[in-house]
């Protein structure tokens, strides 16, 4: 996240951390479901843990965290490597969550965003571009949903509706490490960071978003045929 | 250097348990899942399953009830058990590590396993 | 099922042709295939993974595309050490998978 700020704590509990070994952060992820979380599909990899609960970047221990192995990966079928449509991945947890303060699903938002909406982008992505600089701790940002109009101008054919734009001041924005955590717009998830320009932050460049309210048909489905 | 190795008898009764170990070595396997797979000779390449650290397996179908995959990292080795054989078990049986973006890069050479009486 | 179709099961080309294998998934994979090559009394060796990108040390005149359920091997100028056999493997799922790989497709010296 470029400059943003630190979350407070407890605020975020749906937030997870995709790990390689030993400890290497390489995407967020969101809490959707007691066992369920959802990411970007282009996050996917065979082996990695699941760290939910914890708030800063190192693998010190806390004691709100709870980790996980994913036992299935299910990518959107319409995903395709290396293109940015459909850019979402259900994963199947080894077990349920306890919930606690620190760790709680948050629910998919079946209305889709309207220009102008106020939301929150959070991760432990690189707080700078085109250097990288992780945080110390989980990194919020308030960012505004563009209009459809706003983003194909900025991406010109490069954008459809399973994606969406949106942005703050030049400057400010999600950036690498942050794909797959959460969009959350009136308390519910909206959008998945997705992908963008690099350097991240550039003007007339926002982030762009996988658009989850034309997926929750998707997602409850493959949820219910897996569980 | 990385390199896996099959090792194990090269005859096996009918009805009787093929075994088969791969020794792994110059990479730890808490880092990687493996797979094991075979080939009938003259014929293509079959998966029978994969196995990833946390010791989750996933089975081919057709091989469910009847092959049993483990690992044991302080030994860092991957096993492979395929009971009651039939002489269409007769294959080459390979193992493999996945390069975490779902491709096998790694492939041992292979043992061949005749079941025969 | 997830079952993988190549196509042709085996071709016959010379040295310096463009050749194509193609292979199809009764249903989406997304873009989770892999292209193997196999010669005589060798293990297989990665191609190609995630459909289009290449392994390491790979030759660049292998290159493999497509998306869902139609994926495409293409050498651009097969050379003499090219004659193999190519298999196609999914990695979208392993639930309730009789097998992962193609039936393999043989370049034969024309």
């Known amino acids: 996240i470029i400059n943003g700020s630190d979350c407070d704590m407890h605020t975020q509990p749906w937030q997870a951390a995709l790990l390689l070994r030993p400890n290497q952060l390489y995407c967020g992820a969101v809490l959707v479901h007691p066992q369920w979380l959802l990411t970007a599909a282009h996050c996917r990899k065979k082996v990695f843990r699941v760290r939910l609960g914890h708030y800063s970047l190192s693998p010190v221990y806390e004691s709100g965290q709870q980790m996980f192995q994913g036992v299935k990966s299910i990518p959107h079928p319409g995903y395709s490597h290396p293109g940015h449509s459909n850019d979402l991945m259900l994963i199947k947890l080894n077990r349920r969550i306890r919930p606690t303060k620190d760790v709680r699903p948050i629910n998919v938002s079946s209305h889709c965003p309207s220009a102008g909406t106020k939301c929150l982008v959070s991760g432990w992505g690189t707080t700078k571009s085109p250097q990288v600089h992780f945080p110390k701790v989980l990194q919020c940002l308030n960012i505004s949903v563009l209009s459809q109009k706003r983003c194909e101008d900025a991406y010109p054919r490069q954008i459809d509706d399973t994606m969406f734009c949106a942005g703050d001041k030049a400057g400010r924005d999600s950036c690498q490490g942050d794909s797959g955590g959460p969009v959350v717009c009136n308390g519910s998830l909206q959008g998945l960071v997705s992908w963008g320009d690099y350097p991240c932050a550039r003007p007339n460049r926002p982030g762009v978003y996988t658009n989850l309210c034309k997926f929750t048909k998707w997602i409850q489905e493959t949820i219910q045929a897996n569980s | 250097e990385v390199q896996l190795q099959e090792s194990g008898p090269g005859l096996v009764k009918p009805s009787g348990t093929l075994s088969l170990t791969c020794a792994v070595s110059g990479f730890p396997l808490s880092n990687y899942a493996m797979s094991w797979v075979r080939q009938p000779p003259g014929k293509g390449l079959e998966w029978i399953g994969d196995?990833?650290?946390?010791?989750?397996?996933d089975y081919a179908s057709w091989a469910k009830g009847r092959v049993t995959i483990s690992q044991d990292s302080s030994k860092n080795q991957v096993s492979l058990k395929l009971s009651s054989v039939t002489a269409a078990d007769t294959a080459v049986y390979y193992c493999?590590?996945?390069?975490?973006?779902?491709?096998?890069?790694?492939w041992g050479q292979g043992t061949l396993v005749t079941v025969s009486s | 099922a997830y079952d993988m179709t190549q196509s042709p099961s085996s071709l016959s080309a010379s040295v310096g042709d463009r050749v194509t294998i193609t292979c199809r998934a009764s249903?989406?994979?997304?873009?989770?295939l892999a292209w193997y090559q196999q010669k005589p009394g060798k293990a297989p060796k990665l191609l190609i993974y995630?459909?289009?990108t290449l392994a390491s040390g790979v030759p660049s005149r292998f290159s493999g595309s497509g998306s869902g359920t139609d994926f495409t091997l293409t050498i651009s100028s097969l050379q003499p050490e090219d004659f193999a056999t190519y298999y196609c493997q999914q990695g979208y799922t392993n639930s309730n998978i009789i097998n992962t790989f193609g039936g393999g497709t043989k370049v034969e010296i024309k």
């Open positions: 995630l459909a289009s």
């Open positions: 493999a590590r996945d390069n975490n973006d779902y491709g096998l890069d790694i």
């Open positions: 249903q989406s994979i997304s873009s989770w």
């Open positions: 196995i990833y650290p946390s010791d989750i397996i």
